[in-house]
Structure formats: C-alpha cells, structure tokens
C-alpha cells in the first residue's frame, strides 16, 4: 500500500536499520526509498523540546509486515518509503536549506558569487554531494561568500547543525544537470588499481555498473567475470574512486571488465533496474518466501510484486511436477544485492523491477522496429505526438515530442501567428491522422512556454514547451523520450531517425501515415559551409545525405530527430528548418537539444 | 525597420536591357525567399520570378522565362532582377516581395513585405 | 499552370456592410494561399496567409477561409479605408499565379 503523506508527532517503534542526517523530513523519505531495505523512517525536527543532537536525524526502518508501532512523540515526522508506489520517483533535491550547516568532509573551499553559484559547483564536481555556502551577512569576514564542497561515505551528511547566515543544500547530479562527462564505455580485460569503497556480487558488468552508478561513493568499478581465475573473487564488483576521480592505474588481465558510474548519464539510461534473466545463475540471500510459479517471468512479477524482495532464483519444474509450476525465491540483502552467485545449478535468477520506477520511464525499451519503408508501425515512435490546430478549422500544425507526464516539447515557430493555447489540441499514440476523428481524446495545452530569446526559427532558440491540461498515462502507444544527457555533448550518433506527417517533397500534403526516416547527423562546421548566410550555432544540430533525398519537410516542424544510443533513444533534435527539403548539400536544421536541458528543465520542475 | 527599396527603372527601347535592384534592410535577408511581382498600368498583379534564400533555386513565369534572371547578392543584402530583350507588354511597375519559406511547419505564409516598386516603360 | 479566378469583378457596397470576395483555382492548392490588398496608388499588403490566418497588424474584420480550390475573403463591416482592390494568390506550384482581382467600391 502506498502512503505518501507525512505522519506528524509520530514516531515508529524499533526495525531500526540505521540513522542518517537529512535537513527535512521529505528528504529523509528520499533517502528511505532509495536505500535497499528501508520501508519506513522516523525524522526528528529541530525543537526546543528535544535534545539538539538528535535534531535532523533520520532514522531508517525496516519491517516484516512493513508495518511498526506508532508512538506520540513531539518534533518527529514519520512516513513510508515510495518503494510501495506505484509513481514515478527521484533524488533529485534543488531545495536550499537556511540557516542549516550539513556537515561532511569538506575538501574544497572557494569564493562564490551566490549559493546557486556553489550548488553549480558542488553539481559539476566529480566528488561532491552536498555544500555549505556562507552568505555575505555572515559574521565571520574572511569566511563571507566561501562555497565549501563535501563528501560524505553515504552521500547524507553526518551531522546537521543550526548555523546562521548560511545555506546548504545537494549537488543536483541526480537532477541531469552535470556537467561532468559520461563515460558510457565497459572496458574489457582490464582492471582499474584504486582503493576500493566498496564490493558487491554481481552477474554482469553491466549491473556491476549500475550498482556504482547508484553508490554514492563509486566513481568507477572493475568486474571480475564468472571465468576470472581466482574463484571467490568470481562475479565480485569492486567499487572504486580515487582523488583525481579517475582511475590512476589501468591493468591489463583477462576477465576482468572495468567502467565508469553513469552518474552524469543517468536520466537518459536506466540505472536502477536490472530487467535482464540470468540463465544457470543462482543468487543467493537471505530467504523471504518460496512460491509456486509457471515461469521465470512470472517469478520476476511475484518479486516486483513483494515490496521487500530484492531479486530472485527460479528453478523450473521437473517434468510435469507441481502442475508444471517451479521453485520461485524470493530473497534480499542488506545492500540488495545477491551474497553469492552460483554458476551451473540450473537456476534462472534476476532481480525486483521495482526499482525500475526510480529510472526515467523514457528508458524503457520500446518493441522492435521494422527497418526499411518509410511508413512507421504503432508504437514504433511512442514519445511522438501530433499537435492541431482548431481554428479556423481543425489541421496537423506541428509534431512533439513527450519528455514527461505533462510535456510536450517542439518548435517554438509552430506558434506564429496563435494568439491562445485553447486552439491547440495534442493527439498521442497516433499513427494515421486519419484515426483522428471528432470524439478522438486529446490533451488540452494549458501552457505555451516560447523561449524568450526567440526570434525567428532560422537563428536559433526555435524551442518550445507545451504543458498538458491533464497527465498523459504511459502506455505502449504513448510514453516519453529521454532528453540527452548533459554529459553526452561529445557522443556521436549514428542511429538518428527523423519522424512526421510532413510533405514528402516541398509543395505536397500532410501524410495520413506517420513517416520515418533515417538521417545520418553533419558537423557544424559541414552545415555552415551549406548555409553560408546564415550562422549555425552550437545550439542547432544538422542532419542530412550529402545527395539529398531523405529529410524532414513541411509538416515535420516541432517533431523529434531521434537517436538510439546504448539501446535508449533520446530527442537529440527539434526539427526547425531548412531550405527546400532533401535538396542536395542542404541539411535540415535542428534545434539542438543538449544545449537547452537545463531550460527544458528549469521550466518543467518550477514550482 | 524592415524595408525594401527597389531601384534600377525608366524608359528603354524594345529589345534593350534593363537591371533592377532591391536593397533590404532591417531583416536577415539571407533567410528568406525574394520575389519580383510587377503591375502592367491599369492591370492586376503578375508574378514575374522567385529566387531561394540561398540564391541556388529560380522559377520564372513562362511570359518571361529565358529573357529575365533573378540572382541575389546575401552579403549586400540585394535583389537583383537582368531584363534582357524587352518588350512593350513589360512596361509596369516592378515590386520585390519576400517570402518566408525556410521552416518546416505547414503553413504558407504569403508575400509579407513590399518594396513601393520601381516603374519600367519599354518604348520606341 | 494553375488559374485564379476571382468573382465578382466588382463589388458595390456601403461602409458597414459586409463583404464576400470569392476565388477559385483550376486544381487543389491545399492552403497554400495568400490575400492582398492593394489601395489606389500604393503596394499591395498582406492580409490574409496560409488561406485563413490574420497577418499581422490586420483587423480582425477580414477573416479568410476555404481550402482546395474554393476560397473566400471575409470582410464583416466595412470601413472607408477598405475600400480597394483585392487580390488571392497561390503558390502550390512553383509557378506563383495571381488572381484577376475584385475591385470593391462604395455604393
């Protein structure tokens, strides 16, 4: 059952796992969910009736009927941890915390200009999770406008003091504002010589990563294989970091894999949930339940399903024993990760999918494509959405993309000339416009959010939001595209598709079927040299064949150009403009999307 | 503000040339198509020729077509319409217009600007 | 090449009424269809762009609707300075063609 709300003067009673320091008690539910095992806290407020030590502790819990005693205890807050929901969840904290000191290691003094200069700075450091920023009518003049960076070993700090004059709050990583660069590649063969934090069991280097990627310590991890020669130390996730934040030894051995934490790429690939079956794998924990069930599929389900699972073991029925139903264990950890893995018994082993909600939903994989034809399949290009416009009669204006429950994102020159959003209707999980008839749902715009420094589409900022009037429920037909990750500005594309109902040559008509088309993107410096009277900034992108013949065109305006990185697909760009379309040694121009995350983002999460 | 200026009329004799010119301002000249549309006297508009943003695409009326050619000059912001071999039924009045044409929504958006036009007479 | 064909030639009206100029092209030419104005001695105007949607600055008494072949520009109560010369243009095909005009007079 899922209980969001707060519970005042309310203390839990016992299952206590272990304390950490939050500056409030949302923050503390936060850091419940995401812990492996916390099903429920007690946060203590400041209040002068209780002992100043205890204030801002966060107690985390743990119970078998995921459930505790509840005492009346002024200044505490207690609450459920989000794993029993169903919702969407994420660390991300962009609050500033007045008059707190959140105390922690800190390896970093500088000056800074504001707090929202410091936060920026804990955000684009390798090893900073929260900071501490003494403010201009601090007492103390030689500490005035100091920006102290810390680290903690669980990323929380150790304490939280009352301290005026200055304000705290996290790095905002977890929010795809880093700058930092991500390093998506697993290096074979190769160990990285660094002090370990931290080791965990893993069945792949893969899920070995996504455990660092969630650690708050691990900057990077080395992997030794099932086939590594040293037999206990088979399947072992060694987490790691170092000073300069990047490995300071690479070693050359066989079996061994090594990769860097995802931590700045982490809105744009799934780092949470571990959705693959580990065939002839046995993992091994502590035992919650053992069930009847027909698969390992369903066994997956049955963990998802047990709030306290964390993975487990299937193995399949002996012939036509028990109805043909097998063995499913469900198990957990104290880290939530298996305690042994175990090779050749027979078992198919894999973990919970209820972490899965703590990824992005745009992560998620979407049904194989049918490559080749240029009319698309339902639900090939799930995120995209027509837009129309009602007056003076009812037309396709624009495409879209969904980037979230509530948002649409597109060109901002689709709106020229539209005095109100109450003529705007968006159409999702649309194939043929043709399905769209008068009784048709639709979304209403409640908001139309142009970039203010746009002008016209063909200098650039030709970038748009529309907020939803109601949430759009994800389905199969209809769900959202990752925004790239900041931390991927250098990565090359090579699987970029650009979708519409737009002409297919210059003077035509909307298309009933959604077409697709597969563009290969062109440097900058390439597309100036095609649009010598125009200045192709860093803030389009541009994608076309040398000869031309495949392009967006009139129509297409607002939709995405989509590209498939790591097995995600993200909104690299918006289209825009172009002169004619597939004309040879002319490109179509798009707005590039990395360069506005932090707009679309400021945008989407404001209060 | 935006304005288009042409220039480059007057009186010519049958079979001469003429060179007209349309000097823009106060918009970014290089991202829209230009057109040239004349008016004969007493009569109704007559699309004479269009010329992409970039200068690499040209349409001409048939009326005009192999005597007439639009170019563009982006880095002086000008127009520019060579009449070769003309002829009395030439004799109007000659408007440049511009066209926006380069985004990819559906809409067409229609010649928005209009130079005050420059008069031709083609006469003995 | 695609033919305009605008009707009636002549309109007689009084200021306050309402106007309806219509024009027909020989093929489809989807909304790709602009309106203009052109008052005695002047440059045409832009009125009316992609078939129906207001130019800027224009007032909202000139609505323009249709969209193939059959077009109509609205005028819904004339002022004095309406009184001009009107004119629908396509551009469908690469071939821009012009409407003969509807010359619109006070009674």
């Known amino acids: 059952e899922c209980v969001t709300q707060l519970l005042k003067d309310t203390c839990f009673e016992g299952g206590d796992i272990t304390t950490v320091f939050t500056p409030s008690a949302k923050y503390c539910q936060v850091v419940c969910t995401y812990h492996p095992r916390c099903l429920l806290f007690t946060f203590t407020a400041e209040s002068p009736s209780e002992d100043p030590t205890r204030w801002f502790t966060c107690v985390l819990k743990d119970s078998v009927t995921e459930t505790l005693p509840r005492v009346n205890r002024t200044a505490a807050i207690s609450g459920y941890s989000f794993k029993q929901c169903s919702h969407q969840i994420s660390a991300c904290n962009k609050d500033i915390y007045v008059d707190l000191d959140m105390k922690g290691i800190n390896y970093n003094s500088s000056v800074a200009k504001s707090a929202q200069e410091c936060q920026e700075r804990c955000t684009d450091d390798v090893h900073c999770h929260f900071f501490t920023y003494a403010t201009r009518q601090f007492p103390s003049l030689e500490h005035r406008n100091i920006c102290l960076l810390k680290h903690t070993q669980t990323g929380t700090p150790t304490r939280i003091t009352k301290l005026d004059k200055v304000v705290s709050g996290f790095s905002l990583k977890s929010c795809a504002l880093s700058n930092l660069a991500c390093i998506r590649d697993i290096f074979p063969n190769t160990v990285f010589a660094d002090s370990n934090i931290d080791s965990v069991m893993a069945p792949d280097a893969f899920v070995c990563g996504r455990i660092c990627t969630h650690h708050p310590g691990c900057l990077f991890f080395t992997f030794f294989s099932q086939e590594w020669p040293k037999e206990s130390q088979r399947n072992l996730c060694l987490l790691k970091t170092s000073e300069s934040g990047l490995p300071s030894t690479r070693i050359k051995k066989s079996k061994a894999l090594s990769g860097f934490s995802l931590q700045s790429c982490r809105h744009s690939i799934p780092v949470f949930c571990h959705s693959s079956f580990y065939h002839d794998t046995d993992f091994l924990g502590e035992e919650l339940d053992i069930v009847a069930a027909k698969s390992h599929e369903a066994c997956q389900k049955l963990c998802t399903n047990a709030v306290r699972c964390q993975f487990f073991t299937y193995t399949p029925a002996q012939a036509s024993c028990n109805e043909g139903k097998g063995k499913c264990y469900l198990k957990l950890s104290s880290n939530g990760s298996p305690t042994k893995i175990l090779h050749g018994r027979g078992g198919i082993s894999g973990y919970t999918l209820r972490l899965c909600k703590m990824d992005n939903e745009c992560t998620t994989k979407i049904k194989p494509r049918i490559v080749g034809g240029t009319a698309s399949v339902r639900g090939e290009w799930p995120w995209q959405v027509t837009l129309h416009t009602t007056s003076p009669t009812q037309r396709h204006l624009c495409g879209g993309s969904i980037i979230g429950n509530q948002w649409i994102l597109t060109a901002a020159h689709c709106f020229y000339g539209v005095e109100s959003p109450k003529i705007l209707r968006v159409y999702s999980g649309i194939l043929n416009q043709s399905e769209i008839k008068e009784d048709t749902s639709f979304f209403g715009v409640q908001e139309i959010i142009i970039h203010d420094q746009y002008k016209m589409a063909e200098s650039g900022y030709d970038i748009a939001l529309l907020k939803l009037e109601t949430t759009v429920n994800y389905t199969d037909s209809q769900r959202p595209i990752c925004l790239p990750s900041k931390g991927d500005r250098n990565v090359i594309y090579t699987d970029c598709w650009v979708t519409g109902w737009g002409y297919r040559k210059l003077r035509d008509k909307i298309q009933n079927t959604l077409q697709k088309a597969k563009i290969p993107l062109v440097t900058n410096e390439e597309c100036q040299k095609r649009y010598r009277g125009h200045k192709i900034t860093h803030k389009m992108i541009c994608a076309g064949y040398r000869e031309g013949g495949k392009d967006a065109c009139k129509g297409d305006s607002g939709g995405p150009l989509s590209c498939k990185h790591n097995e995600v697909w993200h909104l690299v760009g918006i289209t825009s403009w172009g002169e004619g379309c597939a004309q040879r040694e002319r490109p179509g121009v798009y707005t590039n999307v990395v360069e506005y995350v932090d707009w679309i983002l400021e945008k989407t999460q404001a209060v | 503000e935006v304005q288009l200026l042409e220039s480059g009329g007057g009186l010519v004799q049958p079979g001469g040339s003429l060179r007209l010119s349309c000097a823009a301002s106060?918009?970014?000249?290089?991202?829209?198509?230009m057109g040239w549309v004349r008016q004969a006297p007493g009569k109704g508009l007559e699309w004479v020729s269009s010329i992409s943003p970039s200068g690499g695409d040209t349409d001409y009326a048939d009326s005009v077509k192999g005597r007439f050619t639009i170019s563009r000059d982006n880095s002086k912001n000008t127009l520019y319409l060579q009449m070769n071999s003309l002829r009395a039924e030439d004799t109007a009045v000659y408007y440049c217009?511009?066209?926006?044409?380069?985004?990819?929504?559906?809409?067409?958006?229609?010649?928005?600007?209009w130079g005050q036009g420059t008069t031709v007479t083609v006469s003995s | 090449d695609i033919q305009m064909t605008q009707s009636p030639a002549t309109l007689s009206l009084s200021p306050g009424e309402r106007a309806t100029l219509s024009c027909r092209a020989s093929?489809?030419?989807?909304?790709?269809l602009a309106w203009y104005q052109q008052r005695l001695g002047q440059s045409p105007r832009l009125l009316i762009y992609?078939?129906?949607s207001r130019a800027t600055g224009i007032p909202a008494r000139f609505s323009g609707s249709g969209s193939g072949t059959d077009f109509t520009l609205t005028i819904s109560s004339l002022q004095p300075e309406d009184f001009a010369t009107y004119y629908c243009?396509?551009?469908?095909?690469?071939?821009?063609?012009f409407g003969q005009g509807t010359r619109l007079e006070i009674k």
């Open positions: 217009a511009r066209e926006r044409t380069m985004v990819r929504d559906p809409r067409y958006y229609g010649m928005d600007v």
């Open positions: 992609d078939a129906s």
């Open positions: 106060g918009f970014t000249f290089s991202t829209y198509s």
């Open positions: 093929q489809s030419v989807s909304s790709y």
């Open positions: 243009q396509q551009s469908y095909s690469n071939l821009v063609t």
